[in-house]
């Protein structure tokens, strides 16, 4: 080995050096939080990026660059001391046009702290491997609630647009004109039943088990669907991004309680299966899926 | 695909009585509101009455107190009975009903709906 290597191996092993780059890293991230930096603290990113770039040629003269098994670029954290550093340079010295969007890679700098500490390194480790193994779990999940989004495509297509109508009309308004002169929210509540607080019409149904309309008032299916549009089993998409609501539990008692007036309380067994399989089963083995490979990795 | 079929029209004598009715075929779900109009030779179409799913009616001024509507929910089916005919009602009958109901590929459609008229003539 050659002095300068024997050196670079020397600084690298120091627990003095590893102290001294997770001390800037840390305070890089200070100075990132400043709403209105002062002109002082460009030179402190420049000191910061020297720092940075000496840990890197530390690393390279001790590890090599890429040609052996165990130099600086076959380890995949270097990589992103590479890209920092690469781009550190970029929006310092190339004059890119618009530069915000390549700043936005100062925050990779905050990543650097993962490689630094030793827990975080093992977290992060687990967090990948997991996403490995979880690909035959998602598969599983992402074929669920495909196979629900379909069911529930069949049943509920439409039904949350259904809404109760005043039956009471001038003499010479129909439905369509209604709705082609309206609107405002207002034009709306002067023609839809509105529950008290409510941002959209009240939902009504068909069926016999169904919501109903209140006196004056009749169920027709027109205009569209709650939420501003974004609740619906209309398409496949949205039926999808309903199920994976329910698979969540983000606010699922709404849709639940929104699709059941529309649709009919016997339907209920569909959100008891949807909550039973995608919520307590699948959740849950995707939660094993990860404890194991965290479990994998501590070993 | 919903029909309203209109009947009962016909030459009456003024002062007599006729009673139409006009019935809705197809696969309803629910009739909301049902309206009689009317448009006389050379004259714009015209209100005469209404009721509604829950049986609240309406009037034109002109036939208050001689025409009375009332529904069958059941048949899907509203009537007009005309008592104290004049000349000034002859015209063609049309009905109107805010219809729900179920269409080609079983999705559901609300609507407005026309039956195609019944000629109600009334002589002096």
């Known amino acids: 080995f050659s002095p300068l290597r024997r050196i670079s191996i020397k600084i690298l092993v120091h627990s003095l050096f590893s102290m001294l780059i997770m001390c800037t890293i840390l305070t890089n991230c200070i100075f990132m939080t400043m709403n209105n930096p002062p002109d002082w603290t460009k030179n402190v990113e420049y000191t910061f990026t020297g720092i940075y770039t000496f840990e890197s040629l530390v690393k390279i003269l001790a590890r090599g660059f890429c040609v052996g098994e165990f130099t600086f670029l076959r380890d995949p954290w270097n990589w992103l001391d590479f890209v920092v550093i690469v781009f550190a340079y970029l929006t310092e010295f190339v004059n890119l046009g618009n530069v915000s969007a390549l700043r936005t890679f100062r925050v990779l700098r905050a990543l650097k702290t993962i490689s630094v500490i030793p827990g975080l390194k093992t977290i992060v480790g687990a967090l990948i491997q997991s996403v490995k193994k979880l690909s035959d779990v998602m598969i599983l999940t992402v074929f669920c609630l495909s196979v629900f989004a379909l069911i529930g495509l069949q049943l509920f297509m439409g039904n949350l647009k259904h809404k109760c109508f005043r039956n009471s009309l001038e003499n010479n308004e129909t439905l369509e004109s209604i709705m082609n002169t309206l609107e405002s929210e207002e034009d709306f509540r002067k023609y839809f039943y509105y529950l008290e607080g409510s941002k959209d019409a009240l939902l009504c149904g068909f069926s016999t088990d169904s919501g109903q309309c209140p006196e004056g008032y009749t169920c027709v299916k027109i205009g569209r669907n709650p939420d501003y549009g974004y609740t619906s089993f209309d398409t496949f998409s949205w039926a999808f991004l309903a199920l994976f609501r329910l698979m969540t539990q983000d606010y699922w008692e709404n849709l639940y309680q929104q699709t059941l007036r529309a649709a009919g309380k016997t339907y209920m067994i569909f959100f008891v299966v949807v909550i039973f399989l995608g919520s307590f089963y699948l959740i849950n083995l995707i939660l094993a899926v990860v404890a194991m490979a965290y479990e994998e990795q501590n070993q | 695909e919903v029909q309203l079929v209109e009947s009962g029209g016909g030459l009456v004598q003024a002062g007599g009585s006729l009673r139409l009715s006009c019935a809705a075929s197809?696969?309803?779900?629910?009739?909301?509101?049902m309206r009689w109009h009317r448009q006389g030779a050379g004259k714009q179409r015209e209100f005469v009455a209404r009721?509604?799913?829950?049986?609240?009616?309406g009037y034109a001024d002109s036939v208050k107190g001689r025409f009375t509507i009332s529904r069958d929910n059941a048949k899907n089916t509203v009537y007009l009975q005309m008592n104290n005919l004049n000349p000034e009602d002859t015209a063609v009958y049309y009905c109107?009903?805010?219809?729900?109901?179920?269409?080609?590929?079983?999705?559901?459609?609300?609507?407005?709906?026309w039956g195609r008229g019944t000629l109600v003539t009334v002589s002096s």
């Open positions: 197809g696969r309803i779900l629910r009739i909301g509101y």
């Open positions: 109107e009903a805010l219809v729900t109901a179920s269409v080609r590929g079983g999705s559901i459609h609300s609507g407005t709906y």
């Open positions: 009721i509604t799913d829950d049986s609240a009616t």
